[in-house]
């Protein structure tokens, strides 16, 4: 779990490798020297821009050589008790909707990112929140429009995939269907939690894999 | 230096089309919301349409709604206003401007072109 | 619709004189989604004020936007003779986005 202080560390990409020898370079050079990050991270950046694919073999190394061991520790690594492995998520079923901020983030993402290339991950979801929180009602009205028309179409689609894994639901009781009802809604809660944080997850990673490539 | 160079205007009769273009320069025009905005021959300003940066959102003014398409193309930096069934009061100097941010509220230009709607 | 009145239609001063340009709105708007806009004939309008108050990059210190609630101000605290223009404001918050009619700001 997230807590867990067993847990493997987390593997490191060849960008971040790169970051920490500029930032123990800047530590040698500058002991007392307090950083500016947002101004480190851009210089960071234009560095890691303008090196040769030899320059950066190293550091691509270092990434390899770490996701070993990532790989290698998560093998022999057991979550505490009660930390169940992810039920089984079928890639035939509807994908979760994404909602009006996730839209307005695909649409404002690439502005931020080129006009701040060296802001993290972390920033410039700060950002993108603080553009959404300072955004009109009516200029979120195209995203939120969007968002309710794929959501439709994603409890029609939902509806439509169970129907067909349960054919044999109809024959069952009204009553019986009643009480699972609410329990299944709340299942379906949690499971879209989990979705929302899968996506988000899943949308970090492309991001720093876009900083690899850099 | 930003630019903004509208272009595309001129005379034509009730009832046609017209599809007014604005070439832009300066700046990476992928990153933002764009918008046309006319002026009526001793008016005021009036917002026509705006489009996000990826040109998959449109908002139109009533004005325009059925009858006015905006549109973009990134990989040529220009933005569109296609305009069918024109009335005499469509006619007006046409402004693409940029949005600043994400907000309906422009920081740069264009000097205009005009459409005359006119039998 | 929001409406956006501006007053005066004309103002008659001269280079040096302060300006006062009034916008009310015909409903209450947040002052975060006020802008104030310099149209001169032939050009392309200029953005001065966004936010109520900000100033746009480039503006010169002398103009300065203020108000909330119905009523909205520009200022232009000594006229210089390349201020003299037509003045809009204009309310984001909710579409359409709407401006005033403009004040014309002569020189007398």
């Known amino acids: 779990g997230k807590g867990d202080p067993k847990k493997p560390r987390g593997k490191m990409s060849s960008y971040a490798f790169f970051v920490q020898t500029c930032r123990e370079e800047h530590k040698k050079k500058h002991p007392d020297a307090s950083v500016n990050f947002s101004e480190f991270s851009k210089k960071c950046s234009e560095r890691w821009k303008t090196m040769s694919a030899k320059e950066k073999g190293k550091f691509e190394d270092m990434a390899k050589a770490d996701k070993a061991r990532y790989e290698r520790e998560m093998k022999t690594y057991i979550p505490p008790k009660g930390e169940t492995k992810k039920k089984f998520k079928d890639p035939n079923a509807p994908k979760r909707p994404p909602s009006a901020f996730f839209l307005f983030c695909s649409e404002y993402r690439p502005k931020i990112k080129g006009e701040h290339p060296g802001l993290s991950i972390g920033d410039v979801a700060k950002k993108l929140g603080e553009m959404w929180n300072n955004t009109a009602a009516d200029d979120k009205q195209p995203y939120e429009k969007k968002a309710a028309k794929l959501k439709e179409k994603y409890e029609k689609d939902i509806a439509a995939y169970r129907a067909k894994g349960k054919p044999d639901a109809a024959k069952k009781g009204v009553v019986k269907a009643e009480k699972s009802k609410k329990k299944k809604e709340e299942e379906e809660d949690e499971e879209d939690e989990e979705d929302e944080e899968e996506e988000e997850d899943e949308e970090d990673e492309e991001e720093e894999e876009d900083d690899d490539d850099e | 230096e930003v630019q903004l160079l509208e272009s595309g205007g001129g005379l034509v009769q009730p009832g046609g089309s017209l599809r007014l273009s604005c070439a832009a320069s300066?700046?990476?025009?992928?990153?933002?919301?764009m918008t046309w905005v006319r002026q009526a021959p001793g008016k005021g300003l009036e917002w026509v349409s705006s489009?996000?940066?990826?040109?998959?959102?449109?908002i139109y003014a009533d004005s325009a709604k059925g009858r006015f398409t905006i549109s973009r193309d990134n990989s040529k930096n220009t933005l569109y206003l296609q305009m069918n069934s024109l009335r005499a009061e469509d006619t007006a100097v046409y402004y693409c401007?940029?949005?600043?941010?994400?907000?309906?509220?422009?920081?740069?230009w264009g000097q205009g072109t005009l459409v005359t709607v006119s039998s | 619709d929001i409406q956006m009145t501006q007053s005066p239609g004309t103002l008659s001063l001269s280079p040096g004189e302060r300006a006062t340009l009034s916008c009310r709105a015909s409903?209450?708007?947040?002052?975060?989604?006020v802008a104030w806009y310099q149209h001169k004939p032939g050009q392309a309008p200029r953005l001065l004020i966004h936010g109520g108050s900000t100033r746009a990059t480039g503006i010169p210190v002398r103009f300065s936007g203020s108000g909330s609630g119905t009523d909205f101000t520009l200022t232009i605290a000594t006229l210089e003779p390349e201020d003299f223009a037509v003045y809009y404001c204009q309310q984001y918050g909710s579409s359409p986005y709407t401006f005033g009619q403009g004040t014309k700001l002569e020189i007398k």
């Open positions: 489009i996000s940066p990826s040109g998959g959102y449109t």
């Open positions: 401007a940029r949005a600043l941010s994400t907000g309906s509220f422009w920081d740069y």
């Open positions: 300066g700046f990476t025009f992928s990153y933002y919301m």
């Open positions: 409903e209450s708007l947040t002052s975060t989604y």
